[in-house]
């Protein structure tokens, strides 16, 4: 497959909406903001990635947090759950 | 167990047209959701058209105006007419069903095998 980093000219996600759905997998790792994604989980449920595309989505949560997802995250992770190893979950400090 | 099967794709010219059909058992389109993704040669796969009573119906921008996707809940498939074919829609085209869970959110997914569809003189 053809590698490709940077995001297209008017791609970037200003959030995260169903639109998304439409963007190969380059295209979320390139043009969609760990930061927003974080802060913007509750809305991921609602849309229907593939599983593939929720691979991307969880690698670029695992850059964001490398020691683990905080609270805020893991309240909102819906169906990405079921993308989570046991390792990812041992590294969760939930209360 | 679930399945879901393509069939109509070929080789067709420029300019022309062609319908892929997806035919699911084991499973409703109704009330969940069916999409059409390609992949061609070298590329990730892309979704082209979808369709959910959640979402309603949506298309790719490169596709808008040219393919049309449709569901005949009788027969439980998901169609996608698609006219006006260039070489840039050479690809393998999959269909792709997802259940809509209750509670919201989705479940599993399903895919074709893939029907080749080639433009060219």
């Known amino acids: 497959e053809v590698e490709k980093t940077a995001c297209p000219s008017g791609k970037k996600a200003p959030e995260i909406d169903e639109s998304l759905i439409f963007y190969k997998k380059w295209e979320l790792e390139a043009c969609v903001d760990a930061a927003l994604l974080a802060t913007q989980m509750d809305r991921v449920n609602a849309i229907p990635f593939t599983y593939e595309q929720l691979d991307v989505l969880k690698h670029k949560l695992d850059e964001l947090y490398p020691q683990g997802y905080p609270e805020s995250v893991i309240q909102h992770l819906g169906y990405l759950f079921l993308k989570m190893s046991p390792e990812d979950i041992r590294k969760w400090n939930v209360t | 167990e679930v399945q879901v099967v393509e069939s109509g794709g070929g080789l067709v010219q420029p300019g022309g047209s062609l319908r892929l059909s997806c035919a699911a058992s084991?499973?409703?389109?109704?009330?969940?959701?069916g999409g059409w993704f390609r992949q061609a040669p070298g590329e990730q796969r892309e979704l082209v058209a979808s369709?959910?009573?959640?979402?309603?119906?949506k298309y790719a921008d490169p596709v808008k105006g040219r393919f049309t996707i449709s569901t005949d809940t009788a027969k439980n498939t998901v169609d996608l007419q698609m006219n006006s074919l260039g070489p840039e829609d050479t690809a393998v085209y999959y269909c792709y069903a997802r259940v809509r869970l209750s509670r919201g959110g989705w479940g599993s997914e399903y895919w074709g095998q893939g029907t080749q569809v080639t433009v060219s003189s």
């Open positions: 369709m959910s009573s959640a979402l309603g119906t």
């Open positions: 084991g499973i409703t389109f109704s009330g969940n959701y």
